[in-house]
């Protein structure tokens, strides 16, 4: 896991290759702080490897957009599922109350 930034920036070097959205497990952006005065982006790949990304790279900016879009879509899907569960529960409750009435 990334070190707590207390004495230096975490990203001394940045990844040279292209990172694809499919290989991403997590993407963390660190705001400037007293220990590091610049934005840092640390990607965790699905194979567990952590790597720093260059915030000024056009490819990285595009990757961040795609990642954030994916994250918000997943959140929407989760919320949708919660909604559906609530509806199902309501239906079940109303069915139960009907059953009670008929018995």
């Amino acid at each position: 896991t990334p070190v707590v930034r207390k004495g230096r920036c975490s990203c001394i070097s940045t990844n040279q290759g292209t990172i694809h959205l499919q290989s991403l497990k997590d993407l963390k952006q660190f705001a400037p702080s007293p220990s590091c005065e610049k934005i840092e982006i640390i990607a965790t790949l699905k194979n567990g490897v952590q790597t720093c990304l260059n915030p000024d790279s056009a490819d990285v900016k595009e990757l961040i957009k795609k990642w954030e879009k994916q994250v918000s879509q997943k959140k929407k899907q989760k919320n949708g599922k919660k909604h559906q569960k609530k509806k199902v529960l309501k239906v079940r409750k109303s069915q139960r109350s009907r059953q009670k009435k008929t018995t």
């Epitope: 990334p2 070190v3 230096r8 990203c11 001394i12 070097s13 940045t14 040279q16 790597t51």
Partner: antibody, heavy 121, light 109 residues
Amino acid sequence: QVQLVESGGGVVQPGRSLRLSCAASGFTFSNCGMHWVRQAPGKGLEWVALIGFDGINEYYADSVKGRFTISRDNSKNTLYLQMNSLRAEDTAVYYCARDWPEGYYNGMDVWGQGTTVTVSS
Amino acid sequence: EIVLTQSPGTLSLSPGERATLSCRASQSVSSSYLAWYQQKPGQAPRLLIYGASSRATGIPDRFSGSGSGTDFTLTISRLEPEDFAVYYCQQYGSSPPFTFGPGTKVDIK
């Protein structure tokens, strides 16, 4: 192939200055943090300085702080070490080394052959 | 400043034997930030192990690293003639300086 070549070493009098250069080739220099490490005759390795990939962050060993300045020119793929107020104890072979660029920190994976600095009156 | 101590200072062994080199830190070091290097006379150092236990590209599997916290070990399972050299550990923690240990010399018995 991936290569680092140091230059600029030589014999210099105490109190004088010297600038070392390290020419990088075979990799994307602007992605990599770069280090200077030195080795006094018959002694072990001593980390001297580090500069981040974008040149924004510099870090120094206490023994050189305020006297040495690390810098880089990404357009020329070159790393520098400006050494001022040189002392006899700065006599060493100076290596430049690449910070591993692929992972989150993995060590210094490429080293130059070294350039010798001798501080003597 | 984190101080690294390596032991023994010199290790005299024969080819085919197992070498165990120790590196102890004065305070805890994250495993992600400990590396081992090999240096032969007149040559630049070479990265062997990073992240305490991962072998660098092209390093034979007879080299292995282990440990965490303040105690780290480099093991060479069967010494080959080309393995006789000086070995350094280095820590690269959350604040500079990024110190090296004093080194362990592995020489032929």
